[in-house]
């Protein structure tokens, strides 16, 4: 592969701890200014498998806020609007990078963690399990 | 209340950004052992809007692999097993942290950066505009 | 520049119910959580509740549960809270303020909606 | 719930004056409390995030120090326009509570 050198101005690394502690700088960039804007849309109603969202929020966590989804039903939604339960409204899960205070209650000291969050729904065929 | 003091074990904060610059210790702590191993389901090929994950690699970021949902349809499968064009097949998104490298091609000094990702689809009924 | 503008203020009869807006200008409505702040003079500042408009969620303070319902309208840009079964109590002025999800502060607020409820 | 325990309640000082206001948390925030300057009829308006952090466009007179229960708020040299009410908040965990603030007049 090619090889990038590193950069001379890169802050020292002759840490004890180097490489598992590094430097952060929390101003966020956002590449997400161009997005499309209907990614913040009415899915969460519109769904055949519609959820609510839930603030969890954590005070030693950064992000502290995140927004959670909950499936409103075990089934879903069929054509003409009633919860079909031959169908599961199952919840789409993601692992993601949050950073947790640490010690704890410290302001300026972190480490990475990786938590689980469910984003949305989505409507799955049951998997049957036929008793012989 | 209860007083929790600040942590006396904390760096320390007398740095000129300080908060905006922190210590991470990038040794990952993963608060998912005890969660369902379903999680890594087969839902994006049992859901009725089903999707494809793609690789996106970036050696500058922190974690450098993210996995992408692509809807593989632009409608949902109905009970036939076939496409339903009365409906739509849409990407659930969600804001997700990572950390930049910055300066560029540096292994200890890095930046928040809220990015965009896809992690599954979800079947939702079409916004129609009636013509008048 | 940012700027959130609110409705006008109310005078209504106690039982009724009121809606004030909020109406973003500026910026992205749906990439910030809305939240609401009642003052008075003798309680102060109180946080009642907070709507993220991009994915509908909402969260409330215990005391205002049973009082206000937050809503936005994406198409507008606009966020809503609904006062029910009004008394001399819910008397005061309402702010909407815009929170930094991330950052994790209030940084823009709505000059404020005076609500009087008197028969 | 957080209680914000601000004083005083009220202070009277001269244009030129240092003065400083203290906020007590009824339990540790961290570093998340911003001070607020509030004018009558008007909103409040953001002066320190993150107890220590200037917000955009505020002159460099107003500071805020402090960590975990204990947050104070200075304004270096009083100006004529910094006579109003100033407030702390936490926005630790919610609900997100507020002090009572202390309304600075004119001696």
């Known amino acids: 592969g090619i090889t990038i050198p590193r950069n001379p101005g890169c802050p020292n690394s002759e840490d004890k701890n180097f490489p598992r502690t590094v430097m952060v700088n929390l101003n966020i960039h956002n590449r997400n200014t161009n997005t499309n804007p209907k990614r913040s849309s009415d899915y969460y109603n519109r769904s055949t498998s519609p959820w609510n969202l839930h603030r969890n929020e954590d005070p030693e966590r950064y992000p502290s806020v995140i927004w959670e989804a909950k499936c409103r039903h075990l089934g879903c939604i069929n054509a003409d609007g009633n919860v079909d339960y031959h169908m599961n409204s199952v919840p789409i899960q993601q692992e993601i990078l949050v950073l947790r205070r640490e010690p704890p209650h410290c302001p300026n000291s972190f480490r990475l963690e990786k938590i689980l969050v469910s984003v949305g729904c989505t409507c799955v065929t049951p998997i049957v399990h036929h008793v012989a | 209340g209860i007083t929790i003091p600040r942590n006396p074990g904390c760096p320390n904060s007398e740095d000129k950004n300080f908060p905006r610059t922190v210590m991470v210790n990038l040794n990952i702590h993963n608060r998912n052992t005890n969660t369902n191993p379903k999680r890594s389901s087969d839902y994006y090929n049992r859901s009725t809007s089903p999707w494809n994950l793609h690789r996106n690699e970036d050696p500058e970021r922190y974690p450098s692999v993210i996995w992408e949902a692509k809807c593989r349809h632009l409608g949902c499968i109905n009970a036939d097993g076939n496409v339903d064009y009365h409906m739509n097949s849409v990407p659930i998104q969600q804001e997700i942290l990572v950390l930049r490298r910055e300066p560029p091609h540096c292994p200890n000094s890095f930046r928040l950066e809220k990015i965009l990702v896809s992690v599954g689809c979800t079947c939702v009924t079409p916004i129609v505009h009636h013509v008048a | 520049q940012v700027q959130l503008q609110q409705s006008g203020a109310e005078l209504v009869r106690p039982g009724a119910s009121v809606k004030l807006s909020c109406k973003a200008l500026?910026?992205?409505?749906?990439?910030?959580?809305f939240h609401w702040v009642k003052q008075t003079p003798v309680h102060g500042l109180e946080w009642i509740g907070v709507i993220h408009p991009g994915n509908g969620g909402t969260a409330y303070n215990q005391n205002f549960r049973d009082k206000a319902t937050l809503t936005a309208d994406k198409s507008s840009s606009t966020a809503y809270m609904e006062l029910s079964s009004l008394t001399s109590e819910d008397s005061g002025v309402y702010y909407c303020?815009?929170?930094?999800?991330?950052?994790?502060?209030?940084?823009?607020w709505g000059q404020g909606t005076a609500l009087t409820v008197s028969s | 719930n957080i209680v914000m325990t601000q004083s005083p309640s009220s202070l009277s000082a001269s244009v030129g004056d240092r003065v400083t206001i203290t906020c007590k948390a009824s339990q540790s925030v961290s570093i998340d409390v911003g001070w607020f300057q509030q004018k009558p009829g008007k909103s409040p308006k953001l002066l320190i995030y993150?107890?220590?952090n200037r917000y955009t466009g505020v002159p460099s007179r107003f500071s805020g120090s402090g960590s975990g229960t204990d947050f104070t708020f200075t304004i270096s040299s009083l100006q004529p326009e910094d006579f109003a009410t100033y407030f702390c908040q936490q926005d630790y965990s919610s609900p997100y509570t507020f002090g009572q603030g202390t309304k600075l007049e004119i001696k």
């Open positions: 993150h107890a220590s």
């Open positions: 303020t815009r929170f930094l999800t991330y950052e994790g502060y209030f940084d823009y």
């Open positions: 500026g910026y992205t409505f749906t990439d910030y959580e």
